[in-house]
Interface confidence: low
Amino acid sequence: KPVSLSYRCPCRFFESHVARANVKHLKILNTPNCALQIVARLKNNNRQVCIDPKLKWIQEYLEKALNKRFKM
């Protein structure tokens, strides 16, 4: 694959037109010095996209995930 010449955050730009129903799974990347990085694997074509953390359903998902984590 092409190689980057300089380090960059995995997600520098975010897709805001992603339907929750089209997401196979989400990956939250903990990358130092980068904004919140959420990568989705899509159902319809198996591609990966970076999702806008400000999406309403993403916020709800993160809230639930955090609540679960702190209840345990």
């Epitope: 694959k1 092409p2 995995p10 520098r12 730009f13 037109h17 990085q37 591609r47 990966q48 996209v49």
Partner: antibody
Framework: EVQLVESGRGLVQPGGSLRLSCAAS????????MSWVRQAPGKGLEWVAN????????YYVDSVKGRFTISRDNAKNSLYLQMNSLRAEDTAVYYC?????????????????WGQGTTVTVSS | AIRMTQSPSSVSASVGDRVTITCRAS??????LAWYQQTPGKAPKLLIY???SLESGVPSRFSGSGSGTDFTLTISSLQPEDFATYYC?????????FGQGTKVEIK
């Protein structure tokens, strides 16, 4: 509907200039790399240039370097190709296309959305 | 620049035939290859990306394979709408070069 519409077609004399525009709709334009591809009459496809989402990275085919400039205005959902010092061999149909990239810098999936093309003729 | 060479440059086939088009890169490009279909007067259409992944909405009779320098596009059973010109494109490095095209014609 995801759509790209080119404009700026024209007949130009050798040495002249022309600016092509591409209006995007139906998708988050600012999230995508974008390309220009051309096709001379009766010939195959030739990739011309592309640029990343914020304009910090631009790449060109050698034959247009120093003459063509790719740019974009994310607020207007528009891509541009400024063509200067035009030559007869620049005569072609010019397509703008959406580059499908993944979240990682090395992910690239080809060009999945294309405009209808706009004709540029360079002739005296 | 990486040179992409397609063969054959044209092929005559009948509806129902299996058609194979090959694309060879002048140097290794991993799986960084896409295939496009273009019908006269129309814009190209993405068929295959990453050498073997079928683009969403493309019929399953199209398939791609290969890695490194040798790649293949196969149409398992040619349909009337498949008569067109097919191009490969590498995206391993700049400039992103295309093959010269393969025209699939009616026999």
């Amino acid at each position: 509907e995801v759509q790209l519409v080119e404009s700026g077609r024209g007949l130009v004399q050798p040495g002249g200039s022309l600016r092509l525009s591409c209006a995007a709709s139906g998708f988050t334009f600012s999230s995508y790399w974008m390309s220009w591809v051309r096709q001379a009459p009766g010939k195959g496809l030739e990739w011309v240039a592309n640029m990343n989402q914020d304009g910090s990275e631009k790449y060109y085919v050698d034959s247009v370097k120093g003459r063509f400039t790719i740019s974009r205005d994310n607020a207007k959902n528009s891509l541009y190709l400024q063509m200067n010092s035009l030559r007869a061999e620049d005569t072609a149909v010019y397509y703008c296309a959406r580059d499908l990239t993944g979240p990682y810098y090395y992910d690239y999936y080809g060009m999945d959305v294309w405009g209808q093309g706009t004709t540029v003729t360079v002739s005296s | 620049a990486i040179r992409m060479t397609q063969s054959p440059s044209s092929v005559s086939a009948s509806v129902g035939d299996r058609v194979t088009i090959t694309c060879r890169a002048s140097q290794g490009i991993s799986s960084a290859l896409a295939w496009y279909q273009q019908t006269p007067g129309k814009a190209p259409k993405l068929l295959i990306y990453d050498a073997s992944s079928l683009e969403s909405g493309v019929p399953s009779r199209f398939s791609g394979s290969g890695s490194g320098t040798d790649f293949t596009l196969t149409i398992s059973s040619l349909q009337p709408e498949d008569f067109a010109t097919y191009y490969c494109q590498q995206f391993n490095s700049y400039p992103r070069t295309f093959g010269q095209g393969t025209k699939v014609e009616i026999k």
